[in-house]
């Protein structure tokens, strides 16, 4: 058929970058190159009906399906998915070619299946058909990793009962606070399942398989850190093991450890201590306490105590299901075009969450970072003064939770103009979302200053383009109207645009780029 | 089959404008975009603008902006492209191609000489 | 604009010997198309997206690259590839078009 490509499909894979995965803070999506789904005409089918190549997506993945029309002007569409409709927005590259995407954030296999895209240009209509399918993955899973006692040994092992069998390493740091990050030179990993070296500031055990990577910290406290403002706090789900370990450093070796439950000490067999001297002769005690599978009467305050420092606690509270707590009301936000802003959403969750940011069904990678008062904060600083509805959403395969903000920017409108036979039409961005006037231009008002006061509908906030709202004016032409000169002007409290227009019959029409104050 | 018919070699004056044009046939012509694409002798190949027949939406590049012009009619499938002010560097062939939405070149016209010379 | 220099300028190759011609792009572009026209003809295309073959080229040629850098191979030169090959890229607004790499055959 000579009249092809003029459509091109393609799928963009969106990885998750394994070195920054690990962070189990964040949830970063890296676009690899698009793969050219070849969208070829489908024979014997009424209308123009395209069918790209099968997509396979691995459980958990996201992906873009997206479609290239060499069409410029107005193009509209609509996506169809199991019977239900879903908002479709399309946009022009600088190729002028539109672009029209369907975004699948974490593919799970209810996403799977026929996506169906209608598109409707002043040329032609096309039907474009998609099929994602689950790539045979679906027995495997990644479980964070947890600890046992290695048998006869004062030792830890790390163990994560994943499919396929993961990877499993020891990241172990001697730093404090940021120096301890992933790629720090502080940071030490060690690819094997068992650890001797239990006396390190921070340890963490990870596991990485085709699903990605998790981990889990060794919780600790030390006795020769000053104490939280606020108590440290464990959650646990029923089942779960838990491990603390409690740290102390002394000039000699004469002092010990012990940990209490509720003012109780602890059961026996449900501890054990080491010790060692350090480079510089100090001593150093680490005191586990650890139950294999906590029940509901294991929560509580436990407290390690040491014959010379002072005793600190942390809350243990476990768990029937996980959770995430945090407001979920939406929130609105106006700026200035330059203001400095992030969005901002703190919570507290158990397991760790996996997390996204979501602009225009494009998302951006999600840090967060634990606080001290047992919470987590997620910023998102990366909005590039874009207007719209952003999506901040959490998981962490016992809860979900979105929240949902508003971003305006205050800016003055720029108005676009267009007409056809019967009326011209005003549209303009800007907020606040601005006011219409319509003017007459004639030899009794050179300047424009005669006002039309009939014919004219404003529909305000009636569309979003690119998340971004959109005012419209337009004012229905009269015969006595034709070939006369008229201006549409919106204006808010930051300024005035205006557009000259000739009502004129169709065709192409000259738009005069007017006063704007 | 496509076809991009261009009209024949033309010899004239510096200062004089030229309008060379390009018939289509064997596709949907307002489906696509016509490119114009300048070659002089044993030189490379320079994009000068396009037009997209279905509504004349018009793209140029910045160094022929202000001396082409770019049209179409609809009604007998052709492209034209009028230069003005010529020079002797406009002296070159003139290519008229079809674009895809893959971004390239799938289909040329034979191409038409364009000789400016005193 | 993005600068598209294509090496070399000129090369010669004898019958059944490997050919690679690069282009290097002045900043990232997502695909590299090329033509390749012979003396008094209008360009042909050649290869699209990078790596793929236009309806009738010949397999022993093949396209690669990403980001700044692409390249043209042919794997056993013929005496009718002998030709001037231009890479293209669309990246940006404006099209551009490498100078040219013209093969001949010794």
């Known amino acids: 058929n000579q009249d092809l490509p003029v459509i091109k499909c393609v799928l963009i894979n969106h990885k998750n970058n394994d070195s920054s995965v690990g962070k189990s803070s964040s949830y970063p999506m890296v676009s690899e190159s698009p793969e050219d789904l070849g969208c070829a005409l489908r024979p014997q089918s009424a209308g123009t009906v395209y069918e790209a190549a099968t997509v396979e997506v691995d459980v958990s993945a996201s992906i873009t399906l997206q479609v290239l029309v060499d069409t410029p002007g107005n193009i509209s569409c609509l996506w169809v998915f199991k019977h239900s409709s879903l908002n479709c927005q399309p946009h022009f590259d600088v190729q002028n070619r539109g672009v029209v995407s369907m975004v699948i954030l974490k593919m799970t296999e209810t996403q799977a299946g026929e996506y169906l895209l209608f598109i409707q240009s002043e040329a032609t209509n096309y039907t474009i058909v998609f099929t994602v399918s689950i790539r045979n993955t679906l027995l495997f899973t990644l479980r964070r990793p947890y600890f046992r006692k290695m048998e006869n040994q004062d030792a830890l092992v790390c163990i994560s009962e994943s499919v396929p069998e993961p990877i499993v390493e020891w990241v172990l740091c001697d730093s404090q606070g940021e120096s301890c990050k992933e790629e720090s030179p502080a940071v030490v990993k060690k690819e094997e399942k068992v650890l001797h070296e239990l006396f390190g500031t921070d340890i963490r055990c990870c596991a990485r398989n085709e699903l990605g990577r998790e981990c889990t910290r060794l919780f600790t406290i030390d006795l020769n850190q000053t104490p939280q403002t606020t108590l440290p706090q464990l959650f646990l789900k029923v089942g779960e093991p838990l491990w603390i370990r409690c740290k102390a450093v002394h000039v000699n070796h004469g002092f010990g450890l012990t940990w209490e439950l509720e003012n109780k000490a602890l059961e026996e067999g449900s501890y054990f201590e080491m010790s060692t001297y350090s480079t510089n002769r100090t001593m150093i005690r680490i005191l586990f306490a650890f139950v294999s599978s906590v029940a509901r009467n294991d929560t509580g305050y436990y407290t390690c105590s040491s014959s010379k420092h002072p005793s600190q606690s942390a809350l243990v509270t476990i768990v029937e299901k996980g959770f995430i707590n945090a407001t979920n009301s939406s929130e609105d936000y106006e700026i200035d075009q330059y203001e400095e802003f992030c969005f901002s959403v703190r919570f507290k969750a158990y397991p760790q969450i996996r997390c996204t940011w979501t602009f225009s069904r494009k998302a951006f990678p999600c840090e967060q970072k634990a606080l001290d008062d047992g919470y987590s904060v997620s910023k998102f600083c990366n909005h590039k003064h874009q207007p719209g509805e952003y999506i901040f959403h959490a998981e962490n395969g016992d809860a979900q939770f979105t929240k949902m903000f508003t971003l305006n920017i205050r800016r003055k409108p720029q108005v676009l103009a267009e007409a056809s036979a019967s009326q011209a039409s005003c549209s303009s961005d800007g907020y606040p979302l601005p006011s219409w006037t319509w003017k007459k231009c004639s030899d009794k008002s050179p300047n424009c200053t005669e006002d039309i006061p009939e014919g004219v509908w404003n529909r305000k906030a009636n569309r979003k383009v690119f998340g971004q709202w959109v005012s419209s004016s337009t004012l229905n032409m009269s015969e006595a109207m034709k070939g006369f000169l008229v201006k549409c002007c919106a204006y808010n409290s930051l300024g005035t645009s205006c557009e000259t227009i000739l009502l004129n019959s169709p065709g192409p029409f000259p738009f005069i780029q007017d006063s704007i104050s | 089959e496509v076809q991009l018919q261009e009209s024949g070699a033309e010899l004239v004056q510096p200062g004089a404008s030229v309008r060379l044009s390009c018939k289509a046939s064997g596709y949907t012509f307002t489906s696509y975009w016509i490119n114009w694409v300048k070659q002089r002798p044993g030189q490379g190949l320079e994009w000068i603008g396009n037009i997209y027949p279905g509504s004349s939406i018009i793209n140029y590049n910045e160094n022929f902006k202000n001396r082409a012009t770019l049209t179409v009619d609809t009604s007998s499938s052709t492209a034209y492209m009028q230069l003005s002010s010529l020079t002797s560097d406009d002296s070159a062939v003139y290519y008229c191609?079809?674009?895809?939405?893959?971004?390239?070149?799938?289909?040329w016209g034979q191409g038409t000489t364009l000789t400016v010379s005193s | 604009q993005i600068v598209l220099t294509q090496s070399p300028a000129i090369m010669s190759a004898s019958p059944g010997e490997k050919v690679t011609m690069t282009c290097s792009a002045s900043?990232?572009?997502?695909?590299m198309h090329w033509y390749q026209q012979k003396s008094g003809t209008s360009p042909k295309r050649w290869i699209y997206?990078?790596?793929k073959l236009a309806s009738g080229v010949p397999a022993r040629f093949s396209g690669s690259g990403s980001g700044t850098s692409y390249s043209l191979t042919i794997s056993s030169m013929e005496a009718e590839d002998a030709a001037t090959y231009y890479c293209?890229?669309?990246?940006?607004?404006?099209?551009?078009f490498g100078g040219g790499t013209k093969l001949e055959i010794k």
């Open positions: 900043s990232s572009v997502s695909y």
């Open positions: 997206d990078t790596s």
């Open positions: 293209q890229q669309w990246t940006s607004k404006s099209p551009t």
């Open positions: 191609a079809r674009r895809v939405v893959y971004l390239y070149f799938d289909y």
